[in-house]
Interface confidence: low
C-alpha cells in the first residue's frame, strides 16, 4: 500500500495516477468549461460536492507539516466522485458510449484512493447528496456539473502530488 | 453556413440492418448535439435520437430503443445511425439535424436544432 500505518504516500505513483486522472476527466467532457450550465436548483447540487479548501493542509506548508490532512481530504473526494461515477446518474439513460472514457475515470479515481487508504485504517467518507433526476436531459446536466467539478477537484490533487513528488518523496 | 449531408439509405429486408451517416460540411462544426429524425408522408417528423457531441452521450426514442445505435467518429467529423432489426414500420425519410452550443439541454423537438439535412429515403420491406 501507498500509506501504510499513516506514513507517507508513494507521491510519484499518486502523482502519475492524478495527471492522468485529469487527462481523463477532460476528455470525459473537454467542452464543460464553455457550457452554460445555470439552472433552477443549481446550487444545491454542487454545493454539497467536495471542495479543497484553504483550512485543509495542502498548501505547500500544511504537506510539510503533516500530509494527512490534505490526503485524507483528497481520498474523501476520489470516493465521493468514485461514487457518482458508479451511480444511476451516469449509468441511466443517456447511454454512454463505448468508447467513453467515463468508464476508465471511474477505475482511476477508484485506483488513486486505494493508494491513499491506509493499511488497516479506514478514513471517514463524505456521504453522496441523494440525486435521482428522472428526466435524461436533467441527468446530461447533472454529468456536466459534476464533471466540471470534478476537474477543478483533480486539478488541485495533481498539484499537490506533483509538489510532494518534488519535495517529499524519500 | 453548415449543410449535413447524409448517405446510406436504401431498401432492407425486416430484420435486416442499415447504417446512415451524417457528416456536416461548409465550415468546421462544433455543434452541442446531432439528432436523427424520421418522417412518413402525411406525419410530423419524430425524433428517433441523438448524441451529445462532446462526450458522446446518446438517447433515443421508445420506438428504436435497443435496435438504432448513433455513434460519432470525431476524427472524420461524421456521425452514424446503426439500425439493426428493422421493421416495416422503420420505413421513413431519416433527417440528421444539429444543433449549436448554446446549451446543455437535451434536444429532442424538431425546434431545438439549428440545422438540417435534406434527408435519406429509407424502405424496409416484409
Known amino acids: 500500500r501507498a500509506v501504510p500505518g499513516g506514513s507517507s504516500p508513494a507521491w510519484t505513483q499518486c502523482q502519475q495516477l492524478s495527471q492522468k486522472l485529469c487527462t481523463l476527466a477532460w476528455s470525459a467532457h473537454p467542452l464543460v468549461g464553455h457550457m452554460d450550465l445555470r439552472e433552477e436548483g443549481d446550487e444545491e447540487t454542487t454545493n454539497d460536492v467536495p471542495h479543497i479548501q484553504c483550512g485543509d493542509g495542502c498548501d505547500p506548508q500544511g504537506l510539510r507539516d503533516n500530509s494527512q490532512f490534505c490526503l485524507q481530504r483528497i481520498h474523501q473526494g476520489l470516493i465521493f466522485y468514485e461514487k457518482l461515477l458508479g451511480s444511476d446518474i451516469f449509468t441511466g439513460e443517456p447511454s454512454l458510449l463505448p468508447d467513453s472514457p467515463v468508464g476508465q475515470l471511474h477505475a482511476s479515481l477508484l485506483g488513486l484512493s486505494q493508494l491513499l487508504q491506509p493499511e488497516g485504517h479506514h478514513w471517514e467518507t463524505q456521504q453522496i447528496p441523494s440525486l435521482s433526476p428522472s428526466q435524461p436531459w436533467q441527468r446530461l446536466l447533472l454529468r456536466f456539473k459534476i464533471l466540471r467539478s470534478l476537474q477543478a477537484f483533480v486539478a488541485v490533487a495533481a498539484r499537490v502530488f506533483a509538489h510532494g513528488a518534488a519535495t517529499l518523496s524519500p | 453556413e453548415v449543410q449535413l449531408v447524409e448517405s446510406g439509405g436504401g431498401l432492407a429486408q425486416a430484420g435486416g440492418s442499415l447504417r446512415l451517416s451524417c457528416a456536416p460540411s461548409?465550415?468546421?462544426?462544433?455543434?452541442?448535439?446531432m439528432g436523427w429524425f424520421r418522417q412518413v408522408p402525411g406525419k410530423e417528423r419524430e425524433f428517433v435520437g441523438v448524441?451529445?457531441?462532446?462526450?458522446?452521450?446518446?438517447y433515443y426514442a421508445d420506438s428504436v430503443k435497443g435496435r438504432f445505435t448513433i455513434s460519432r467518429d470525431s476524427a472524420k467529423n461524421t456521425v452514424y445511425l446503426q439500425m439493426d432489426s428493422l421493421k416495416p414500420e422503420d420505413t421513413a425519410v431519416y433527417y440528421c439535424a444539429a444543433r449549436t452550443p448554446n446549451s446543455s439541454w437535451f434536444p429532442t423537438t424538431l425546434y431545438e436544432y439549428d440545422y438540417w439535412g435534406q434527408g435519406t429515403q429509407v424502405t424496409v420491406s416484409s
Open positions: 448524441i451529445i457531441w462532446t462526450g458522446g452521450y446518446t
Open positions: 461548409g465550415r468546421a462544426f462544433s455543434g452541442s448535439a
